[in-house]
């Protein structure tokens, strides 16, 4: 899937854009907002009625090398009594993010953008029930 | 991240970390197409902490369209279909990487940008404190 070209709504003199070889693009991986600290709700993964755990995946040929994935702890949801209610479902919520993949081809190294599907957390849903004849 | 060249015969001058600027192929490697989350699942309607999805569009960013979740209620939906305010609908937030056109409007020059998105909502049982 290719990145769409900018439409005609913008006009930029070609000389002010860096020259880029055909079929590729220039990517600065110094992240904008890298040091922005996010105030996430504490313990939401433990206090949720559809709680989850986190696993860190690590790949030295990926940037960023660490990607955190969530896994729902239960099939059902936790009720007011703290017991699992299997008439409800804990389901994963997913979001796509971009990573840069480093590839070795012989002695040369190339870089490829990749979309990664990250499981962010879980939510409790009412299942759709079908009675099979 | 550290990498060792695959071929022992390769010169070992490779930087172990990613360089600051790289040339990447215009084709994004991915089996997951960027779909509207409304079409990919109806969890946003069936959750006990349902949410609405708002379209955030920015032509200077890739992907240009990102869907933001907003919890529909302060509380959660109980078994009777009513809002239970002793529970909380809380957004699940995630930092993701996107591409920002840099310099602006340039077709093939980007910089990675970290943004915080609300992906969905989850129902939380709060710990209660009575303030003296």
């Amino acid at each position: 899937r290719k990145i769409p070209k900018v439409g005609h709504t913008f006009f930029q003199k070609p000389e002010s854009c860096p020259p880029v070889p055909g079929g590729s693009m220039k990517l600065d991986i110094g992240i904008i907002n890298e040091n922005q600290r996010v105030s996430m709700s504490r313990n939401i993964e433990s206090r949720s009625t559809s709680p989850w755990n986190y696993t860190v995946t690590w790949d030295p040929n990926r940037y960023p090398s660490e990607v955190v994935q969530a896994q729902c702890r239960n099939l059902g949801c936790i009720n007011a009594q703290g017991k699992e209610d299997i008439s409800m479902n804990s389901v994963p919520i997913q979001q796509e993010t971009l990573v840069v993949r480093r590839k070795h081809q012989g002695c040369s190294v190339s870089f490829q953008l990749e979309k990664v599907l990250v499981t962010v957390g879980c939510t409790c849903v009412t299942p759709v029930i079908h009675h099979v004849q | 991240g550290i990498t060792i060249p695959r071929n022992p015969g390769c010169p070992n001058s490779e930087d172990k970390n990613f360089p600051r600027t790289v040339m990447v192929n215009l084709n994004i490697h991915n089996r997951n197409t960027n779909t509207n989350p409304k079409r990919s699942s109806d969890y946003y309607n069936r959750s006990t902490s349902p949410w609405n999805l708002h379209r955030n569009e920015d032509p200077e960013r890739y992907p240009s369209v990102i869907w933001e979740a907003k919890c529909r209620h302060l509380g959660c939906i109980n078994a009777d279909g009513n809002v239970d305010y002793h529970m909380n609908s809380v957004p699940i937030q995630q930092e993701i990487l996107v591409l920002r056109r840099e310099p602006p409007h340039c077709p093939n020059s980007f910089r990675l940008e970290k943004i915080l998105v609300s992906v969905g909502c989850t129902c939380v049982t709060p710990i209660v404190h009575h303030v003296a």
Epitope: S39, S41, R42, N43, I44, R47 | K70, C71, L74, N88, V90, V124, P126, I127, V128, H129, H130, V131
Partner: nanobody, 116 residues
Framework: EVQLVESGGGLVQPGGSLRLSCAAS????????FGWFRQAPGKEREFVAG????????EYAASVKGRFTISRDNSKNTVYLQMNSLRPEDTAVYYC?????????WGQGTLVTVSS
Amino acid sequence: EVQLVESGGGLVQPGGSLRLSCAASGRANSINWFGWFRQAPGKEREFVAGIRWSDAYTEYAASVKGRFTISRDNSKNTVYLQMNSLRPEDTAVYYCVLDLSTVRYWGQGTLVTVSS
């Protein structure tokens, strides 16, 4: 530790108005929502109104919708409940609630009496 200071309760005639306020201090950061519950004598505590801090989205109990208005002052970490067209059935102890998603703080309550 979080402190909640409630004020504005009192005696009012049917059809009258009152304005409750609740100020949060201490470690009241990452607010999810701020609002009010009430408890009438011999009844269960019930939700009245709430305001989400991130976008000022408001929610009301059906019994008060159109009569009560919740608002906030971000800079003061304060929430207000403007109560108009008060009825005898609105008589209750009104509790301020500060919700931080996984932790919730309840105030001590302020008494509102609607009587002629």
